[in-house]
């Protein structure tokens, strides 16, 4: 059963490391897969010192931890590199994290990524 | 500490009903993808179901459709199996685990003993 | 209906080197398959050992590592230890939240 399902065709494309991967730096990327499997998009990126560095961003191969997701929202407490997927054209555009630890209330810090 | 850990398990009959629990902790259980899996006796494991982090989707083998429901309650951390019109064949330790990003299962629990038999 | 297919046992001798291989009856395994791999002792639950191919779990020794070879996902374990018998099972993800296991591995620690 799926409830609510929104497809994922296009993903905004990023890639730090695109001079040494040979990949245009920006751009929005489309979500080829198997007619049966679902795609996302996701975005990775750093905090350094408090300033954000995105690392990349684009189309994320199906994945049930990404079902249901619309928002791109890293809950992981305090990870070295943060992560997180969604589904939704372009869903991948804003990024924020929102650590979601055992008993303390959440903080919210959202971030519009400016490459 | 990550910990899952599984109960409702027993005896039934053939057709009868029970409906198992997995209860977590030391992580934010809201936040990830759920599976139970089973292994009957001297032989390997089975995947039978899976549910999305807000329960909206869920998944189950061919061989359990129509007859397992899976569930979560994110405010109680809680993952659950019901099992209805149970066969001999349903007859398994089931264990509950969670799945992280690239969708595999990187906790387990201890797993809980169903017995389908007359 | 897809069966993923592993040797139903493997025998090492201590130190030496074993490769699990995991394959199915639908084409070629690949890593969007995200293929990861689980020890088990009887009686005990399941370990996760490798997972997406190739990255180890955390507290895995490095002897265990993950790979494609050819058309199926690959465990290899180097230096083989007493305490790696046990039963080894992969598992692809299929998509659209469906899992399917191998039969597992016997893996036998000789002498």
């Known amino acids: 059963a799926i409830l609510g399902r929104s497809e994922t065709q296009e993903c905004l494309f990023f890639n730090a490391n695109w001079e040494k991967d040979r990949t245009n730096q920006t751009g929005v990327e489309p979500c080829y897969g198997d007619k049966d499997k679902r795609r996302h998009c996701f975005a990775t990126w750093k905090n350094i010192s408090g300033s954000i560095e995105i690392v990349k961003q684009g189309c994320w191969l199906d994945d049930i931890n990404c079902y249901d997701r619309t928002d791109c929202v890293e809950k992981k407490d305090s990870p070295e590199v943060y992560f997180c997927c969604c589904e939704g054209n372009m869903c991948n555009e804003k990024f924020s994290y929102f650590p979601e630890m055992e008993v303390t209330q959440p903080t919210s810090n959202p971030v519009t990524p400016k490459p | 500490e990550v910990q899952l850990l599984e109960s409702g398990g027993g005896l039934v009959q053939p057709g009868g009903s029970l409906r198992l629990s997995c209860a977590a902790s030391g992580f934010t259980f809201r936040n990830d993808a759920m599976s139970w899996v089973r292994q009957a006796p001297g032989k390997g494991l089975e995947w039978v179901s899976g549910?999305?982090?807000?329960?909206?989707?869920?998944f189950y083998t061919d061989s359990v459709k129509g007859r397992f429901t899976v569930s979560r309650d994110n405010s109680r951390n809680t993952l659950y199996l019901q099992m209805n019109s149970l066969r001999a064949e349903d007859t398994a330790v089931y264990y509950c685990a969670k799945v992280y990003y690239t969708s595999f299962f990187d906790y387990w629990g201890q797993g809980t003993l169903v017995t389908v038999s007359s | 209906q897809t069966v993923v297919t592993q040797e139903p046992s493997f025998s090492v001798s201590p130190g030496g080197t074993v490769t699990l291989t995991c394959g199915f009856n639908?084409?070629?395994?690949?890593?969007?398959?995200?293929p990861s791999w689980y020890q088990q002792t009887p009686g005990q639950a399941p370990r996760t050992l490798i997972y997406n191919t190739n990255t180890r779990s955390s507290g895995v020794p490095d002897r265990f590592s993950g790979s494609i070879l050819g058309n199926k996902a690959a465990l290899t374990i180097t230096g083989a230890q007493a305490d790696d018998e046990s039963d080894y099972y992969c598992v692809l993800y299929m998509g659209s939240g469906i899992w399917v296991f191998g039969g597992g591995t016997k893996l036998t620690v000789l002498g």
């Open positions: 639908s084409g070629s395994v690949s890593t969007s398959y995200y």
């Open positions: 549910i999305s982090v807000t329960g909206g989707s869920t």
